[in-house]
């Protein structure tokens, strides 16, 4: 019977008794930088080259004893999760390993960024097909780690990683924080995130999804024949990397950014239960977990986007946070977030020649997030337009007047502390969807762009009670773009997208009573594009 | 996921024209920053990864490490360069007291130097 | 799904032997430490003896130890449990049963956490007497 | 060796009752801890396993508790189904122990 970690990564037109999807990515060479290996095992012989790295820490203890099986453990069971006869994601990729973890799976920054530049190398001397590495290993946060994986992400090599069995945040590790990899937790065959002794999982922004992590059977070094089951966020990175693999192999010529945003696309949502994470880092933590696409090809129709949340800004009167997307992204809205709800609003702002998305704190505020919603959207030609606060008791208003550009979100930014204190709402007038409007001492920005087909719609929800929680989707074949709240209501928290949803939180209202401002209008902006799925339909 | 400028402990070391003369301080106006592990049982001090400024030539970065070695053994410090990073970041990987870290944040090229730490399996 | 049958139960007089076997399905047979589990007529649960993954480990309840051994076979998909110098006492419906549990790493520490015995098998019945 | 005592040896209690049944360690095991159901002529069923983990299929009625010495079962709302005789085993090594059983009847 198929394991349970490779039935909840199997859309269900693959499953059957033996699971063997379409292409078990051949093309695709994965790195793995771990502990030794026992490359006769009958799971992965012949489908691993243990390359000549290694670069290892000496065992800690005078009593330590090498046993080669257990100096190869780690090693030997993620190289059968990725690619195992068995027991493997991606049954078709070869592997390259490289030793950078000791017989106690302990290394060092620097061992692992010598590996990370062989790679490199190796790729410079004899390009092949696309690469994947896989880091199954945390350490503290490390600048220059992140920096040597944004580096090596840069030249086309996609890198997996553990996000870390801390039960902690996974900004505090490297390389988890680094913004280029591709960091996954551990889940359950119950969804659950995954517990190992008394920590688990780590979670938070710096995690792209989760995968199966928690009793995977594969390769044990006991012997050639043998298999064990082992758990954390290893095995869950490795399910991943045997994912990029499978649709790398469908699809060569994917980039980094594209591959991302089809494994978030593809993941199963909303499945995990939250409770577990830390109340502050339940809204931070991407509730998906992995899947193989339903099909090799025909996803490039769609247009995918993420949301990038930032870093907390921190309580200071003036502080600021900013939410980036990744450089083949384009920025098409900007939100924010305050859990004490003091905040001042939020601004698309060029940073480096890019879009950035920058949130500001108000004063006696505990702090506040910028979210980036950060899309793939081929020949796009974005641009913020801004309208300075009117004087008008109607509100700010500013639309995308350029010929050919549609808008794709709104933000409002305000100098004042307490905006709309005891201020009716302004309502935005029906009949003109390429028009952000604000209170009159906000400044409103308006993300216009214009790509080949793009085509976006407001969709609106409100609802005339006090409510924590507000939310608007776009419908199948739209996706969600801009996330936004109605100006008026002063107890809003801010507004942020979960895949295709615009969430609108505002404060418990238990504590701020049914007044004339309860009223909370969510808003969503919804595009396709029809140039895209054309491409697509020609395609096949 | 995590900003450059992140959680992370960071010491930034103040550079003060010494004995070793203006003309091998870095370009005026940046200061080269050491940062080190905040979880303390991970720290591994005493070998330090020194980065150079991203288009730092592999031949300037030896010349830097031979120059950290000239300086320090002047006042009495051994030390041995592990790696010379090319390929990915310009840099070198140094076993060295801790002593001489404000001598090599002053180095010409330098962008920052990280004391090295343990990374686990997971 | 994950199948245990026993066989090899019987009659046996004190002083024989006896030879159990348990036949698994799947891959998931050897990925994890397996146990004998007996329970005399009327009476509770008791823990015999288990084995790990590749048969390197074992461990015994002290009333069998020196008598019964405990053995798998990964090729086989199979669990022995060979019964010597059978006394009364060793009367009982015997199960055989999967040990699930996980090894993980955490801050250099290889560690194994325990489940408990998630498939049985339906038992088979050993009787000694004269 | 770890001794498992279980309390009460016999309980009788109603359909729709809340039912609790208590074992104690002869020293801690930390959470190391397992309960099974029994039905007549039938192998154990895993119920919860660490203290308080609910094996994946159980009914959501099934909890546990406990840490150290003293460890519980609670049924919140009995149904027809869960008469049967009750199990803790201890997995502190990999030696282990289970108690003597409770036995819930039908009052």
């Known amino acids: 019977s198929i394991p349970w970690n490779l039935e909840r990564i199997t859309p269900p037109r693959y499953r059957a008794d033996e699971y063997q999807p379409p292409d078990g990515g051949s093309l695709v060479e994965v790195y793995l930088l771990d502990t030794s290996i026992q490359s006769d095992h009958r799971e992965i012989e012949g489908r691993v080259m243990v390359t000549d790295f290694e670069n290892v820490p000496e065992e800690d203890g005078t009593r330590f004893h090498r046993q080669a099986s257990k100096c190869d453990s780690h090693g030997t069971h993620l190289a059968g999760v990725v690619s195992g006869r068995d027991a493997g994601v991606a049954k078709g990729a070869s592997m390259r390993s490289l030793r950078v973890l000791n017989c106690q799976g302990k290394g060092t920054v620097s061992g692992t960024l010598i590996g990370l530049e062989f790679i490199r190398k190796s790729q410079l001397v004899q390009p092949v097909g696309p690469l994947v590495v896989l880091l199954p290993l945390a350490g503290g946060y490390s600048r220059v780690l992140n920096a040597a994986c944004q580096r090596l992400a840069r030249a086309g090599v996609v890198l997996v990683t553990a996000a870390g069995n801390f039960r902690d945040d996974a900004c505090l590790y490297s390389p988890a924080s680094a913004p280029e990899v591709i960091t996954v937790g551990a889940t359950n065959a119950q969804d659950q995130p995954v517990t190992l002794g008394t920590l688990g999982t780590n979670f938070g922004r710096c995690v792209d999804l989760f995968a199966p992590g928690e009793d995977i059977i594969g390769a044990s070094s006991d012997c050639s024949t043998c298999f064990v089951s082992q758990s954390g966020t290893s095995q869950a990175a490795a399910h991943v990397a045997g994912i990029a693999a499978m649709m790398l192999s469908a699809e060569p010529e994917l980039t980094l950014a594209e591959l991302r945003q089809r494994l978030i696309h593809f993941s199963a949502k909303d499945v995990i239960n939250e409770a577990w994470f830390p109340e502050d880092q339940r809204v931070l933590t991407p509730n998906l977990v992995a899947a193989l696409p339903p099909s090799t090809h025909g996803a490039g129709w769609q247009l995918f986007c993420r949301t990038v949340w930032s870093a907390h800004s921190g309580p200071t009167r003036m502080a600021t946070a900013v939410a980036r997307c990744a450089p083949d992204e384009e920025l098409l809205s900007c939100s924010s977030f305050s859990r004490s709800g003091k905040r001042r609003g939020e601004r698309m702002e060029a940073q480096g020649g890019k879009l950035v998305c920058r949130a500001h704190n108000a004063f006696g505020g505990e702090g506040v997030y910028a979210i980036a919603r950060c899309c793939l959207l081929p020949q796009a030609n974005c641009s913020v337009h801004t309208a300075p606060p009117a004087e008008a008791s109607m509100g700010t208003r500013v639309h995308c007047h350029q010929q050919g550009h549609v808008l794709t979100g709104c933000s409002s930014h305000w100098e004042v502390e307490d905006l709309g204190t005891h201020k009716p709402p302004v309502l935005r007038p029906r009949g003109q969807p390429n028009q952000c409007v604000g209170h009159r001492e906000a400044s409103i920005h308006a993300s216009c762009c214009h790509a080949p087909g793009l085509e976006c719609k407001v969709k609106e929800h409100g609802i005339p009670a006090p409510q924590e929680q507000v939310t608007v989707a776009c419908e199948e074949g739209w996706t969600l773009t801009g996330c936004s709240a109605l100006p008026g209501t002063s107890h809003v928290l801010g507004a942020y997208a979960v895949d295709n949803t615009c969430v609108v939180r505002s404060r418990d209202v238990s504590t701020t009573g049914s007044t004339s401002e309860g009223a909370v209008t969510a808003v969503a902006i919804c595009c396709r594009s029809r140039h895209l799925a054309q491409a697509s339909q020609e395609l096949q | 996921q995590e900003d450059e400028d992140g959680d992370y402990e960071e010491l930034v070391l103040a550079l003060r024209s010494e004995e070793d003369g203006l003309a091998e301080a870095p370009e005026h106006g940046t200061t080269a920053t050491f940062h080190r592990c905040a979880k303390d049982p991970w720290r591994l001090p005493g070998t330090y990864v020194v980065v150079l400024k991203e288009e730092t030539h592999l031949s300037q970065s030896e010349r830097t490490a031979r120059r950290l070695q000239a300086q320090a053994a002047r006042r009495g410090y051994l030390t041995k360069i592990l790696h010379v990073f090319h390929g990915l970041l310009p840099g070198f990987l140094v076993k060295m007291s801790g002593d001489l870290l404000e001598l090599a944040l002053k180095l010409p090229h330098v962008d920052y130097i990280e004391e090295d730490s343990s990374v686990f399996a997971q | 799904e994950v199948q245990l049958v026993e066989s090899g139960g019987g009659l046996v007089q004190p002083g024989g032997s006896l030879r159990l076997s348990c036949a698994a399905s799947?891959?998931?047979?050897?990925?994890?430490?397996m146990s004998w589990v007996r329970q005399a007529p009327g009476k509770g649960l008791e823990w015999v003896a288990n084995?790990?993954?590749?048969?390197?480990?074992?461990y015994y309840v002290d009333s069998v130890k020196g008598r019964f051994t405990i053995s798998r076979d990964i090729a086989k998909n199979s669990l022995y449990l060979q019964m010597n110098s059978l006394r009364a006492e060793d009367t009982a419906v015997y199960y055989c049963?999967?040990?699930?549990?996980?090894?993980?790493?955490?801050?250099?520490?290889?560690?194994?956490?325990?489940?408990?015995?998630?498939?049985w098998g339906q038992g088979t019945t050993v009787t000694v007497s004269s | 060796d770890i001794q498992m005592t279980q309390s009460p040896s016999t309980l009788s209690a109603s359909v729709g009752d809340r039912v609790t049944i208590t074992c104690r360690a002869s020293?801690?095991?930390?959470?190391?801890l397992a309960w099974y159901q029994q039905k007549p002529g039938k192998a154990p069923k895993l119920l919860i396993y660490?203290?308080?983990s609910l094996e994946s299929g159980v009914p959501s009625r099934f909890s546990g508790s406990g840490s150290g010495t003293e460890f519980t079962l609670t049924i919140s709302s009995l149904q027809p189904d869960d008469f049967a005789t009750y199990y803790c085993?201890?997995?502190?090594?990999?030696?282990?122990?289970f108690g003597q059983g409770t036995k819930l009847e039908i009052k």
């Open positions: 799947g891959i998931t047979f050897s990925s994890y430490w």
């Open positions: 020293q801690s095991i930390s959470s190391w």
């Open positions: 660490k203290a308080s």
């Open positions: 084995i790990k993954q590749d048969g390197s480990e074992k």
């Open positions: 085993q201890q997995y502190n090594s990999y030696s282990y122990t």
């Open positions: 049963a999967r040990d699930r549990g996980t090894y993980y790493y955490q801050d250099g520490n290889y560690n194994y956490y325990y489940y408990g015995m998630d498939v």
